[in-house]
């Protein structure tokens, strides 16, 4: 799955919440960021995430089987220079400071469920999705025959505004 361009094709700023309307929040603790899944107090502002969208060739089209075979991959950055990354060994999702070009662990294949409902599949471990486990984000293996319908891997995007990138 190779990214076809070094620049994102589009970007947007959005808040991220679970299917059950819990907010995904990010807190700086001991010089590293922690990710929480929590009910937000009424007046508390939702944390924003910059989603950068990249086009990628689907593996089947690289091998000549696919017709056009493009996929959309996203990176998620809640604050400057930090990106959500898959730790496939620990089955965890972590925030790491990175420089571009970003590592493969920072890319997730975008799956639309409806207009604002999405899932994020790990680029480095197909079939494994960002999900919610014990009020934290984790990597969850999903059986494709289940139609990826499990609510714990569904997230809602509430767009705040479009982000102009250069």
């Amino acid at each position: 799955m190779s990214i076809t361009g070094i620049s994102p094709i589009t970007e947007s700023l959005a808040s991220l919440s679970t299917y059950n309307d819990q907010s995904i929040t990010f807190a700086l603790e001991d010089e590293s960021y922690e990710i929480y899944v929590e009910d937000l107090k009424k007046d508390k502002k939702k944390d924003k995430v910059l989603l950068s969208y990249y086009e990628s060739q689907h593996p089947s089209s690289e091998s000549g089987d696919g017709v056009d075979g493009k996929m959309l991959m996203v990176t998620l950055s809640p604050t400057k220079d930090f990106w959500l990354q898959a730790n496939n060994k620990e089955h965890s999702v972590e925030l790491h400071k990175s420089e571009k070009p970003l590592p493969d662990q920072a890319f997730f294949v975008l799956h639309n469920r409806s207009f604002n409902s999405v899932s994020f599949e790990s680029k480095t471990d197909p079939g494994v999705f960002i999900g919610v486990k014990d009020n934290h984000l984790a990597l969850i293996k999903v059986d494709y025959s289940e139609n990826l319908g499990s609510e714990n891997i569904l997230f809602k995007l509430s767009e705040i505004h479009h982000h102009h990138h250069h």
């Epitope: 947007s12 799956h111 639309n112 409806s114």
Partner: antibody
Framework: QVNLLQSGATLVKPGASMKMSCKAS????????VSWVKQSHGKSLEWIGE????????NFNKEFKDKATLTVDKSTSTAYMELTRLTSEDSAVYYC???????????????WGQGTLVTVSS | IIVMTQSPKSMSISVGDRVTMNCKAS??????IAWYRQKPGQSPELLIY???NRYTGVPDRFTGGGYGTDFTLTINSVQAEDAAFYYC?????????FGGGTKVEIK
């Protein structure tokens, strides 16, 4: 290559319903969202709604929520749109379309069927 | 609903000319715009997506530009086959809306 083959032109009476088909070939049908677009004679385009064949999930333009029903038959790689309570306002060419991306809609229409002309007249 | 307004409504040009048409969104849509060409009696075809990305197989005489609310489609060295209606469309968010179209006639 990708091909979306739509059913033929139909003449229907006001108040009736009709169902048109869109047979997909040349790609993995279940992995791409299918949209439907309306074009009235000499007019612009209107998006009706979309369906994800893998799960049957769908999204609609509010204007068409009570007018159109979208379904798929995975075994034949065919998408269907049924229009109900037809009036002269529904006379148009209807296109099925498909986006450029696996799994993700983005509501971009990269491939189009040849269109189905629906004429509502008594 | 975001309204897409295209101008001019029609234009008549000669083969080899350069032509620019406009599309204005009623709100900021970022770069979430696509352009389509619809030749007489045919289905529309995708030319440009995300404002400036040429779709696979589209000739490089087609160029898209703009961001926010104002967008352009430029055809360098117009060919006879470019006689068509051109539509802009807001993509990415629901509901996607189309402009009223610009008709390009070849003299």
């Amino acid at each position: 290559q990708v091909n979306l083959l739509q059913s033929g032109a139909t003449l229907v009476k006001p108040g009736a319903s009709m169902k048109m088909s869109c047979k997909a070939s040349g790609y993995s049908f279940t992995d791409y969202w299918v949209s439907w677009v309306k074009q009235s004679h000499g007019k612009s385009l209107e998006w009706i709604g979309e369906i994800y064949p893998n799960s049957g999930a769908n999204n609609f333009n509010k204007e068409f929520k009570d007018k159109a029903t979208l379904t798929v038959d995975k075994s034949t790689s065919t998408a269907y749109m049924e229009l109900t309570r037809l009036t002269s306002e529904d006379s148009a060419v209807y296109y099925c379309t498909r986006g450029p991306y696996y799994y993700s809609s983005q509501i971009i229409f990269a491939y189009w069927g040849q269109g189905t002309l629906v004429t509502v007249s008594s | 609903i975001i309204v897409m307004t295209q101008s001019p409504k029609s234009m008549s040009i000669s083969v080899g000319d350069r032509v620019t048409m406009n599309c204005k969104a009623s709100q900021n849509v970022g770069n979430n715009i696509a352009w389509y060409r619809q030749k007489p009696g045919q289905s529309p075809e995708l030319l440009i997506y995300y404002a400036s990305n040429r779709y696979t197989g589209v000739p490089d005489r087609f160029t898209g530009g703009g961001y926010g609310t104002d967008f352009t489609l430029t055809i360098n060295s117009v060919q006879a086959e470019d006689a068509a209606f051109y539509y802009c469309q807001r993509i990415y968010n629901s509901p996607p809306t189309f402009g009223g179209g610009t008709k390009v006639e070849i003299k």
